[in-house]
Amino acid sequence: QSGPLPKPSLQALPSSLVPLEKPVTLRCQGPPGVDLYRLEKLSSSRYQDQAVLFIPAMKRSLAGRYRCSYQNGSLWSLPSDQLELVATGVFAKPSLSAQPGPAVSSGGDVTLQCQTRYGFDQFALYKEGDPAPYKNPERWYRASFPIITVTAAHSGTYRCYSFSSRDPYLWSAPSDPLELVVTGTSVTPSRLPTEPPSPVAEFSEATAELTVSFTNEVFTTETSRSITASPKESDSPAGPARQYYTKGN
């Protein structure tokens, strides 16, 4: 045996953002032929000896960081990247607004504001299909996400979440969707390969994206760290990226 065994992948299906009481499956995947897996919940000293953890109803206590490894012979693999399992709907939804408004001319500026009645110091902005994060200034009770020099690519549906840095895996419900419309351009923005969003399809978690792979990234401006929160990395070339732009206090 030369060098350590390669790390497995750990993913949450359908998503690592899980509404309370909804199901989620954590799956650890190593090389073919491996059948001895250990799935750990960090900061709780607990583990199980299965590659798959099915959670029929998401609970607050199950939110947190997970990691897995496998054993081959007497050797342990490197650990997987950590997966951050987030419980959503723990708190009331914030409101998301656009200033000066949700219709903006191409080349203009717009600021998306996520506001909560709680004293939360963390906000996450999510745009369907958006490939890159924004830089975020900070505000208490409110997060401003300025978009400078708007282009057609900024068109789309946005939602935001609020949460506390003291409980970083317990998030609010998603805000109502905000449709940002960029006028004065004929370029059609890229969209999800599914039907248009609807209020019933709760940010597509339970419907359109069930069979779509995606990569989530959480960006914390305070520490400039990037974490893969639902790392289904390369199975679906056509899959949209869901971005979370986290603004920390």
């Epitope: 001895l36 960090l42 709780s44 000293s45 607990r46 199980q48 000896d49 490894s69 007497s74």
Partner: antibody
Framework: QVQLVESGGGLVKPGGSLRLSCAAS????????MSWIRQAPGKGLEWVSS????????DYAASVKGRFTISRDNAKNSLYLQMNSLRAEDTAVYYC????????????????WGQGTLVTVSS | QSVLTQPPSVSGAPGQRVTISCTGS?????????VHWYQQLPGTAPKLLIY???NRPSGVPDRFSGSKSGTSASLAITGLQAEDEADYYC???????????FGGGTKLTVL
Amino acid sequence: QVQLVESGGGLVKPGGSLRLSCAASGFSFSDHYMSWIRQAPGKGLEWVSSVGSEGKFIDYAASVKGRFTISRDNAKNSLYLQMNSLRAEDTAVYYCARHYREFRWHYYYFDYWGQGTLVTVSS
Amino acid sequence: QSVLTQPPSVSGAPGQRVTISCTGSSSNIGAGYDVHWYQQLPGTAPKLLIYGNSNRPSGVPDRFSGSKSGTSASLAITGLQAEDEADYYCQSHDLGAHVWVFGGGTKLTVL
């Protein structure tokens, strides 16, 4: 109530072998990870080996790997430690310990310990 | 040499407060693994005292408390009593080879 009773300790010459047993009662033995932990005279605790609830996952401390073998018999509610090529530094009290378990989850700590059995390796 | 580092001894007078530190590394305590504490009274087997950094099993007095921060942890004992004289061990898990690791132990003397 939970009981763990170790046996099989004694005096053995360097290079010799010994088999320790741990009889478990008062709980569902087959649900729990089990470990052997030792304590040399006047020294601290040292984890030796652990075995998964079904006997699949097995881990050893580097100091005993290749010489000691842990096993379990769930039908007999028993844990074993086969010790070969014994050395003077293996002299210790050997404890059998149960890992805590709750629902489907195992935990990385020991909630019950036996009283221990003394192994002395000396010529 | 133990993977987790504890002071060899601490002491205090009855009624006082003492703390015992436990220092690990990025592959054990700092890797997200909890710290657990055991009390070993003279001539007896170790007994679980604190699990999951700060939780007490039933029957353990609330004079005993634990905390964890970064790559280290500590055990605090308030209102020291003569019967607290014992050896105290911290324990965690190490990610490298999935091994259980202990501190070298701290002997508490009640003056």
